[in-house]
C-alpha cells in the first residue's frame, strides 16, 4: 500500500496523525472495533500536547481512549509502552473498582469532563476518538 499523505474527509490532522471524534456513544469494545474498521485505533495519548489537542476537541464529555487493562496490566491498543509513557489520571485513579458487581474491575480508560483520565465499566456508551498515523501505509492500493 501507499503512504497516507492527508487525512480522510471529516478527520482532523494534528502532528502527523489524523483524528476522528464521534458524536454518539458506544461501549469500549464497539468503539475499538469501529476504529479498527476505519483502519485506525482508539486514540493513544503520548504527550501533554496531544492531550490538550484531544481535550479541546471533545470538550467536557466522557470519551473513551485506547487504554485498557482487560487482560491484566494497562495496555495501549497500538502497543505504546504504558509504564514509560504519558499519563494523566485523576487523583487516586486508576482504582480498578470491583464494587459495581459485574465480576470484573473497571477495565477501560476514558477522558473525564476535565480531561483527566478515569477507569470505568467498559459497557458505558461513551463517545470515542479514533486515531491513525499519516505515515502509516494505507490499505488502499496505490493509484496507477
Amino acid at each position: 500500500g501507499s503512504e497516507r499523505t492527508c487525512c480522510p474527509v471529516n478527520w482532523v490532522e494534528h502532528e502527523r496523525s489524523c483524528y476522528w471524534f464521534s458524536r454518539s456513544g458506544k461501549a469500549w469494545a464497539d468503539a475499538d472495533n469501529y476504529c479498527r474498521l476505519e483502519d485506525a485505533h482508539l486514540v493513544v495519548v503520548t504527550s501533554w500536547e496531544e492531550q490538550k489537542f484531544v481535550q479541546h476537541h471533545i470538550g467536557p464529555v466522557n470519551t473513551w481512549m485506547g487504554l485498557h487493562d482487560q487482560n491484566g496490566p494497562w495496555k495501549w491498543v497500538d502497543g505504546t509502552d504504558y509504564e514509560t509513557g504519558f499519563k494523566n489520571w485523576r487523583p487516586e485513579q486508576p482504582d480498578d473498582w470491583y464494587g459495581h458487581g459485574l465480576g470484573g474491575g473497571e477495565d477501560c480508560a476514558h477522558f473525564t469532563d476535565d480531561g483527566r483520565w478515569n477507569d470505568d465499566v467498559c459497557q458505558r456508551p461513551y463517545r470515542w476518538v479514533c486515531e491513525t498515523e499519516l505515515d502509516k501505509a494505507s490499505q488502499e492500493p496505490p493509484l496507477l
Epitope: 482504582d95 465480576g103 470505568d120 459497557q123 456508551p125
Partner: antibody, heavy 125, light 107 residues
C-alpha cells in the same frame, strides 16, 4: 430493605436554583449509579443524567448541560441534583433511581431497579 | 439523540385480554431496552430489562421481545392491577431516552 428517600417539595421563582436530595439505605451506596429523571404533570419521563457515587463522575443529558449539577456525600449515602436558572418548564416531579450494569451470559444491560418517591418542584413567579 | 416512539398511545381493554404495546427506536439499539410501569402518583417500576429479561417479582404474564429497532411488551391476560402507563427506555446511548408512554385503561 433497599430504599431511596427524597427531600420534600420545593417552590422556586424563575431564575433561582433548586437542590433535591436522595438518601440511599439498605445497600452499598457506592455500588450503584444514581440517575435523575423528571416528569412534568401529565407528561412522560425525561432523563437528566447519572452520577457514580464512588468517585463522583457524572454524565448529563446535553439539554441540561451547564444547568444541572449532580453531587454526593458518601458519608451519609446521599445524592444531590441541583438545577439552576429555573424556568416554568422545569416544574415537574424529580425522581432519583439507582442503576448499574448487570450481566446475563455475555450480554450487559443497564438496570434502573429502585426509584425514589419523587420530589415536586414548582417554578412560579 | 435516539428517539423512542410507542404505539398505541392509549388503549382500552378488559380484564383477561391479551395486550401488546410496541416501542420503536430511531436507530438500532440491539437489546438495550427496558420496560417500566407507572401508576398515578407513583414512581415508575421496572418490569423488563435487556428487551426480554423479566425482573424478579414481576408476574409471568408480562413478557418482552424484539431487538434492533422494534420491541414489544405483551401482557398475556390483563389483570385489574395492570391498568397503568407503560414506558420503554433505551440505554444504548446517552442521553437515555424514554418512549412517550402507552396508557392502558379499562374498557
Amino acid at each position: 430493605q433497599v430504599q431511596l428517600e427524597q427531600s420534600g417539595a420545593e417552590v422556586k421563582k424563575p431564575g433561582a436554583s433548586v437542590k433535591v436530595s436522595c438518601k440511599a439505605s439498605g445497600y452499598t451506596f457506592t455500588s450503584y449509579d444514581i440517575n435523575w429523571v423528571r416528569q412534568a404533570t401529565g407528561q412522560g419521563l425525561e432523563w437528566l443524567g447519572w452520577m457514580n457515587p464512588k468517585r463522583g463522575n457524572t454524565g448529563y443529558a446535553q439539554k441540561f448541560q451547564g444547568r444541572v449539577t449532580m453531587t454526593r456525600n458518601t458519608s451519609i449515602s446521599t445524592a444531590h441534583m441541583e438545577l439552576s436558572s429555573l424556568r416554568s418548564e422545569d416544574t415537574a416531579v424529580y425522581y432519583c433511581a439507582r442503576g448499574r450494569y448487570s450481566r446475563e451470559d455475555y450480554y450487559y444491560y443497564y438496570d434502573m431497579d429502585v426509584w425514589g418517591q419523587g420530589t415536586t418542584v414548582t417554578v412560579s413567579s | 439523540d435516539i428517539q423512542m416512539s410507542q404505539s398505541p398511545s392509549s388503549l382500552s381493554a378488559s380484564v383477561g385480554d391479551r395486550v401488546t404495546i410496541t416501542c420503536r427506536a430511531s436507530q438500532g439499539i440491539r437489546n438495550d431496552l427496558g420496560w417500566y410501569q407507572q401508576k398515578p402518583g407513583k414512581a415508575p417500576k421496572r418490569l423488563i430489562c435487556a428487551a426480554s429479561r423479566l425482573q424478579s417479582g414481576v408476574p409471568s404474564r408480562f413478557s418482552g421481545s424484539g431487538s434492533g429497532t422494534e420491541f414489544t411488551l405483551t401482557i398475556s391476560s390483563l389483570q385489574p392491577e395492570d391498568f397503568a402507563i407503560y414506558y420503554c427506555l433505551q440505554h444504548h446511548d446517552y442521553p437515555f431516552t424514554f418512549g412517550p408512554g402507552t396508557k392502558v385503561d379499562i374498557k
